[in-house]
Structure formats: structure tokens, C-alpha cells
Interface confidence: low
């Protein structure tokens, strides 16, 4: 004898938005107000996050997905869906454990958040420094002197350094 | 599931030593700053030590010279070596993770008790 | 040492009070902002409610909130709940050379 039919579960063809009611004999009940379920065959709907103080709502909650948030202006998101706010600091400056604080010399930052990073070593390339590097900006390479002959190419700025961000995760 | 686990609380001799474990999950470690966080029974909470992402470390007066936070990488778990132990050390001993600032401790461990008496 | 004092170490309030529990530090916090505030229920482990003295964590009701700057912050719940019974502790971050501080802790109770 071959089983042909599997034992299913009562509540899977409950689809998203709605959740499998117990009191209502598994009947596909829909979420109530402020929750949803963003799968098929819940028990129950999720809350709705609700992005008060600082966090302000990027999409509105529907029965289907939760709301998603972001930051106020002055602050920066951290942790997968933004479960954090952080605060930015000023270009030039780093985020440390105890705050804002400016890049040390021969480091810098050019965002609001993230970290300072060196300047461009243009010596590495055979180049020399055409405009040195701030807190704020790195350094721009020039031709090295072997390049100052007739025809020589322009000026070469450094390539862009990749934003390293924050990675809470 | 992003969460914290300790282990290694017992009991322990005046002048002994003991190593906690605090496993993490669902994060890693090293993009992380942790701190041991500890409560004496019926006490309030009392800041030990913080291992930042880059590895520094800092400690409390109390713990400053007896205890090293460390961490492995590879098996994703912070350590707190206690050395010197005394009995007012006996506590629940939190591993908890924070975000930016030191005082953003968001995540933490269920705690596990050490108990120093002779 | 730097002192962190909490006041009061424990208040009896009805439900809907508005409840008021303040961290005095004899040293300026970093940034005069690096103070959070926490929730520790019986046998439960902390909760971080406030960071940045005055930013709601996230999933916290906003019957909670923080103020205060420098030496001086303030926890204030607008209108206390059957579920806010607990105690609050407040943690305060300085410079590299002196300890992180948790206050003492104040002990809320339904009258």
C-alpha cells in the first residue's frame, strides 16, 4: 500500500496577510490593524513597527510587510533594518567609541559617518603630492618628475576610497 | 538568531581563577564591541570591561590587573580570564554587545554566576 | 572616583503617574551625551531603553523618554504602567582614563 497523500497542515494555505485563527477553527482570519504577516500559513501577525523619536517611517506598515524606517536628519542607521540610530559627525571627524572625534593627522574622512581613512601614499605610483591631504580630503597625486617632460599626461587623482561604513552585524 | 550564550560560572576559592565563555550568534564578534557587564546578587549592575572591534581593551578599576577580556574569532566567543578572584567578585557575570557608543549595550546574555567563597 | 547618584533608589507610584528618575555624575559624560538608561525586571536581564541620553531604542514605548545633558539626566516615564515595574539603572560613558558608571539603580513600584 502506497501513501499517495500527505497529512497537511490545515493552516498553510492561509496566505500573507492573513494568519491561521485557532479560535476560529484554522479559518484564514486577516491580520488586525497595525500588524501583518509577510508569509503563508502563520499563527499569528507580527506587530507593526512603529518608527517614533528619532527613527522616522521610509514605507508604512502593510498586511503583507512591516513598516521599514529611517533616521532624522543628524543621524545615520546601524544594524540590519535600521534597528539603530546613530548620530553623524562632521566630515573630517570619526565616530569612536566615546564620540565625535577628528581624524588624526595623515587620516581623513569625507562622509558624515564611517571612519577616517589614510591618505594616498602617491609615492607607491612614482608620484609626487600635488595638493596635500586635510582632514576632510585626501591628497591629490601629481606626475612624478619623470613625467614633467614635453607631453607628459595631467594631473591623476587618486582613486576613490571605498566608503567603509559601520557593519553592527 | 543574534544572541549571546556565557558559560564557565561556578564556584571558586578565594585566590582562584576562572575563565567565562560568552558565544555569540547570528554576528560576529570582531565587528564588535562587547563588554562584561556584572551584578552581585540583590546588587545593581556594575560595568568589568570592554573589548572594542579593533581589539582594544578597557577595564574597570576593580577589574584592572586581575581579569583580561579576549576573543576568538574563529569560534566567535569572548572570554573573560579571572585571576585573584575575591569574594566580591561572587556575581551574575553579562556578556552584552553594543552598538557606537560604550552605553548602547542592546543585546545581552542570559548570565552565568560565579560564586567566589572558601 | 567619579560618582554616578541616582535618585531615588526606589518611588511607589499609581498607575498613569508621571514618573521622574534622575542620574547626577560629578564628571561630565563623553560628548555630554554618552548616557543611556535601562530596565532590568525581576530575574530578567537589562534592557537598553534610552541611548544618547535622550534617543529611544528601538521597539520601546514612548511613555519613555530621556533629557539632560553634561552632569545632569533625566528618565521619565509620562504614564506609568502595570509593566514598567522594575529598575532602572542609568550608564554613563567618559573620557579614556575613568570607568564606565552605572548609578545605583531606582526601584519602581505600583502602589
Known amino acids: 500500500f502506497e501513501r499517495t497523500r500527505s497529512l497537511q497542515d490545515p493552516c498553510s494555505n492561509c496566505p500573507a496577510g492573513t494568519f491561521c485563527d485557532n479560535n476560529r477553527n484554522q479559518i484564514c482570519s486577516p491580520c488586525p490593524p497595525n500588524s501583518f504577516s509577510s508569509a503563508g500559513g502563520q499563527r499569528t501577525c507580527d506587530i507593526c513597527r512603529q518608527c517614533k523619536g528619532v527613527f522616522r517611517t521610509r514605507k508604512e506598515c502593510s498586511s503583507t510587510s512591516n513598516a521599514e524606517c529611517d533616521c532624522t536628519p543628524g543621524f545615520h542607521c546601524l544594524g540590519a533594518g535600521c534597528s539603530m540610530c546613530e548620530q553623524d559627525c562632521k566630515q573630517g571627524q570619526e565616530l569612536t567609541k566615546k564620540g565625535c572625534k577628528d581624524c588624526c593627522f595623515g587620516t581623513f574622512n569625507d562622509q558624515k559617518r564611517g571612519i577616517c581613512r589614510p591618505w594616498t601614499n602617491c609615492s607607491l605610483d612614482g608620484k609626487s603630492v600635488l595638493v596635500n591631504g586635510t582632514k576632510e580630503r585626501d591628497v591629490v597625486c601629481g606626475p612624478s618628475p619623470a613625467d614633467l617632460s614635453p607631453g607628459a599626461s595631467s594631473v591623476t587623482p587618486p582613486a576613490p576610497a571605498r566608503e567603509p561604513g559601520h557593519s553592527p552585524q | 538568531e543574534v544572541q549571546l550564550v556565557e558559560s564557565g560560572g561556578g564556584l571558586v576559592q578565594p585566590g582562584g581563577s576562572l575563565r567565562l565563555s560568552c558565544a555569540a550568534s547570528g554576528f560576529s564578534l570582531n565587528n564588535n564591541a562587547i563588554s562584561w557587564v556584572r551584578q552581585a546578587p540583590g546588587k545593581g549592575l556594575e560595568w568589568v570591561a570592554i573589548i572594542q572591534n579593533t581589539g582594544t581593551t578597557d577595564y574597570a578599576r576593580s577589574a584592572k590587573g586581575r581579569f583580561t577580556i579576549s576573543r576568538d574569532n574563529s569560534k566567535n566567543t569572548l572570554y573573560l580570564q579571572m585571576n585573584s578572584l575575591r569574594a566580591e567578585d561572587t556575581a551574575v557575570y553579562y556578556c552584552a554587545r553594543g552598538y557606537g557608543f560604550e552605553s548602547e549595550l542592546v543585546i545581552w546574555g542570559q548570565g552565568t554566576l560565579v560564586t567566589v567563597s572558601s | 572616583d567619579i560618582q554616578m547618584t541616582q535618585s531615588p533608589s526606589s518611588l511607589s507610584a499609581s498607575v498613569g503617574d508621571r514618573v521622574t528618575i534622575t542620574c547626577q555624575s560629578s564628571q561630565s559624560v563623553y560628548n555630554n551625551n554618552a548616557l543611556a538608561w535601562y530596565q532590568q525586571k525581576p530575574g530578567k536581564v537589562p534592557k537598553l531603553l534610552i541611548y544618547?541620553?535622550?534617543t529611544l531604542a528601538s521597539g520601546v514605548p514612548s511613555r519613555f523618554s530621556g533629557s539632560g545633558s553634561g552632569t545632569d539626566f533625566t528618565l521619565t516615564i509620562s504614564s506609568l504602567q502595570p509593566e514598567d515595574v522594575a529598575t532602572y539603572y542609568c550608564l554613563g560613558v567618559y573620557n579614556d582614563d575613568v570607568d564606565n558608571g552605572f548609578g545605583g539603580g531606582t526601584k519602581v513600584e505600583i502602589k
Open positions: 544618547l541620553a535622550s
